[in-house]
């Protein structure tokens, strides 16, 4: 064997955002023949060796970093890429709006605004079919989303979440859809 | 309450063996890992080895792999080590020590330790 | 040589605080490991004081108090007294070997 054991991947199923009380189940894949897995939620000492981890209802003390690893003979593995597991729906609800309207021309400009009554510092915009959300390279952390010079690929339904940096997998329920219209 | 006790230590030669035991009572001693952790004479603390609840499970640290065999008996509520191809630098006390469990979740901590055996290597 | 880094002895007056640092790299305390402290008076069996970082297990008095951050740790003692006298290990996990690891420890002296 030479060099490290290539790290397993980790996945949340149905998805990494989780409503409260909903299930999740994660799962760390690494090659056939594995002789030890073992899953850990950093920042917190726990772990369990084995693949999967079935969370039959979300809860608060769950939400968190992931990590898995697995073990062959005496070797162990890099470890997979971190996977966040968030707790949606423990707050209200933001609003989510376009501005100017959500009809837009192909080749305008759009900017899509989360608000919400809590005085959170964090907002996460995700487009229905997109497994990661919406980042502006630069300000994707704000109550505004400005897209630039849109694409019929911009089309579709919109959903936005606000937190706190503080606890930043506690995240509020979904903003109603919003459908952008690109004409 | 929950109790670990070693015994099995003594004076060794080098290039001898010796099998450590450690007794557990007051939990449920098929659920937790267990370690074995050291102590030379005047020095700080170093982790041995770590087995799984069902022994299947099982971790050295680099000082004694190959050399030491951390096994478990469920059934009897006990712990071993087995210590081969022994060195001067294998003399300390051998502590046992559980991990901290709660419901499904294994913790990276000790929350209760034995009060320790003593292995002596020494011609 | 330890893992962790501690310094190898600290000493205080009745009453003063002392703390105990406890230093790490980016595969144990920096990976997202936590710190756990552990007491270890003269002639006896190491005693869980900290875990996680700064939780007290129930029995340890809320003079002892600690913290993380970044790659290191420390352990706080105020209203320092004769009994506190006694060796302190810090520990996490390091995440190359999955190996439990240990500080040097610190050996701590009430003075007069």
């Known amino acids: 064997q030479s060099g490290p054991l290539p790290k397993p991947s980790l996945q949340a199923l149905p998805s990494s955002l989780v409503p409260l009380e909903k299930p999740v189940t994660l799962r760390c894949q690494g090659p056939p023949g594995v002789d030890l897995y073992r899953l850990e939620k950093l920042s917190s000492s726990r772990y369990q060796d084995q693949a999967v981890l079935f969370i039959p209802a979300m809860k608060r003390s769950l939400a968190g970093r992931y990590r898995c690893s697995y073990q062959n003979g005496s070797l162990w593995s890099l470890p997979s890429d971190q996977l966040e597991l968030v707790a949606t729906g423990v707050f209200a609800k933001p609003s989510l709006s376009a501005q100017p309207g959500p009809a837009v021309s192909s080749g305008g400009d759009v900017t899509l605004q989360c608000q919400t009554r809590y005085g959170f510092d964090q907002f996460a915009l995700y487009k229905e079919g997109d497994p990661a959300p919406y980042k502006n390279p630069e300000r994707w952390y704000r109550a505004s989303f400005p897209i630039i010079t849109v694409t019929a690929a911009h089309s579709g339904t919109y959903r936005c979440y606000s937190f706190s940096s503080r606890d930043p997998y506690l995240w509020s329920a979904p903003s109603d859809p919003l459908e952008l219209v690109v004409t | 309450q929950v109790q670990l006790v070693e015994s099995g230590g003594g004076l060794v030669k080098p290039g001898g063996s010796l099998r450590l035991s450690c007794a557990a009572s007051?939990?449920?001693?098929?659920?937790?890992?267990v370690s074995w952790i050291r102590q030379a004479p005047g020095k700080g603390l170093e982790w041995v080895s770590a087995?799984?609840?069902?022994?299947?499970?099982?971790q050295y640290a680099e000082s004694v792999k190959g050399r030491f065999t951390i096994s478990r008996d469920n059934a009897k509520n006990s712990l071993y080590l087995q210590m081969n191809s022994l060195r001067a630098e294998d003399t300390a006390v051998y502590y046992c020590?559980?991990?901290?469990?709660?419901?499904?979740?294994?913790?990276?901590?000790?929350?209760?330790w034995g009060q320790g055996t003593l292995v002596t290597v020494s011609s | 040589q330890s893992v962790l880094t501690q310094p190898p002895s600290v000493s205080g007056a009745p009453g003063q605080r002392v703390t105990i640092s406890c230093t790490g790299s980016?595969?144990?305390?920096?990976?997202?490991?936590?710190v756990h402290w552990y007491q270890q008076l003269p002639g006896t069996a190491p005693k869980l004081l900290i875990y996680?970082?700064?939780n007290r297990p129930s029995g340890v008095p809320d003079r002892f108090s600690g913290s993380k951050s970044g790659t290191s740790a420390s352990l706080a003692i105020t209203g320092l007294q004769a009994e506190d006298e006694a060796d302190y290990y810090c520990?996490?996990?390091?995440?190359?070997?999955?190996?439990?690891?240990f500080g040097g420890g610190t050996k701590l002296t009430v003075l007069g």
């Open positions: 020590a559980r991990h901290y469990r709660e419901f499904r979740w294994h913790y990276y901590y000790f929350d209760y």
């Open positions: 520990q996490s996990h390091d995440l190359g070997a999955h190996v439990w690891v």
């Open positions: 007051g939990f449920s001693f098929g659920d937790y890992y």
């Open positions: 996680g970082n700064s």
């Open positions: 087995i799984g609840g069902s022994g299947s499970a099982v």
């Open positions: 980016s595969s144990n305390i920096g990976a997202g490991y936590d």
